[in-house]
């Protein structure tokens, strides 16, 4: 029976240009963790393989960064990194856990500043 | 137990527009995870045209995307298909199935076969 | 597009046997391979994900190895259910891709 659970950071923002560290947990079980997949929408990003270790997509390599843990980094952001996020825990003897991240990319504050505060 | 079932005309004409739909069961579409169609022409492999995510974003398969359209009706938890200028080489089975987040396919429906005939 | 190559296209084997059947991905796909079973007739079933990972309630007599582009689909004791065709698919990136199947036939 599949006990754990999986805690993710959420819903994250980010501004535009900068990095952010997608981490999710598992917990509440005493499973082996043997593989975590990362992916946006369909595209995989990583996956981290206990035997095999880190392996980055080749679209993604200039930009993500393994860890820190089984977590990922995400480097230089766009808005078009906005979206969701999964984290695939593939453990022995449960199965498979997913978690969720919905990550929101931000234009930077002096722009956001300009756009909302402008001079009459 | 999430289950899916295809419905649609067994023939259709060449030139003309297919449409199928698949009435899941079981679980919402709008829920999680993405509903896909995958089609295997008679004695062949199978092939992934394209599916519709539980937000509504849209995949298709490159080598259908101009002829191919996947949408959805969330008061029937139903998803459809619709293949146009269709020739007698789009003469398959027609599975929709469940997508995983990894990518792989857990369940399917159990297949309608579409003859494109004259 | 990633290509799947199966091999054999078909073979024949008795209960019992150790069967093997391999698949190479045109381009590195990690461990992101998936294999299938299916009967005449009958949908698809899902029976490794990731290379490597049984799927709920399939037999330990199945088993997946292999990452990059070399994979290989394991049964250690043939069952007379176990009779059909077998696909392997990546599940790296869209579109996602299927071998071209393999005939598991009674000798």
């Known amino acids: 029976m599949m006990t754990g659970t999986i805690e993710t950071t959420g819903n994250i923002s980010a501004e535009k240009g900068g990095s952010i560290i997608l981490q999710c947990h598992l917990s509440s079980t005493t499973a082996q963790v043997t593989q975590v997949n990362w992916e946006q929408q369909d595209q995989l990003l990583a996956i981290c393989n206990a035997d095999l270790g880190w392996h980055i997509s080749p679209s993604f390599k200039d930009r993500v960064a393994p860890g820190p843990g089984l977590g990922l980094t995400l480097q230089s952001l766009t808005v078009n990194d906005t979206g969701e996020y999964f984290c695939i825990y593939h453990t022995y003897p449960d199965g498979t856990y997913t978690g969720r991240i919905f990550l929101e990319v931000l234009e930077s504050s002096v722009a956001e500043h300009g756009a909302r505060f402008q001079i009459p | 137990q999430v289950q899916l079932q295809e419905s649609g005309p067994g023939l259709v004409k060449p030139s003309q527009t297919l449409s199928l739909t698949c009435t899941v069961s079981?679980?919402?579409?709008?829920?999680?995870?993405?509903w896909n169609w995958i089609r295997q022409p008679p004695g062949k492999g199978l092939e992934w045209m394209g599916y519709?995510?539980?937000?509504?974003?849209?995949r298709y398969n490159p080598s259908l995307k101009s002829r191919v359209t996947i949408s959805r009706d969330t008061s029937k938890n139903q998803f459809s298909l619709k293949l146009s200028s269709v020739t007698a080489a789009d003469t398959a089975v027609y599975y929709c199935a469940r997508k995983y987040y990894g990518g792989w396919f857990p369940q399917w429906g159990q297949g309608t076969l579409v003859t494109v005939s004259s | 597009d990633i290509q799947m190559t199966q091999s054999p296209s078909s073979l024949s084997a008795s209960v019992g046997d150790r069967v093997t059947i391999t698949c190479k991905a045109s381009q590195d796909v990690f461990t992101a391979v998936a294999w299938y079973q299916q009967k005449p007739g009958k949908a698809p079933k899902l029976l490794i994900y990731s290379a490597s990972y049984r799927d709920t309630g399939v037999p330990s007599r199945f088993s997946g190895s292999g990452s990059g582009t070399d994979f290989t689909f394991t049964i250690s004791s043939l069952q007379p259910e176990d009779f059909a065709t077998y696909y392997c698919q990546q599940s790296y990136s869209t579109p996602w891709t299927f071998g071209q199947g393999t005939r598991l036939e009674i000798k």
């Open positions: 519709i995510s539980y937000s509504g974003i849209t």
């Open positions: 079981g679980y919402s579409i709008t829920d999680d995870y993405a």
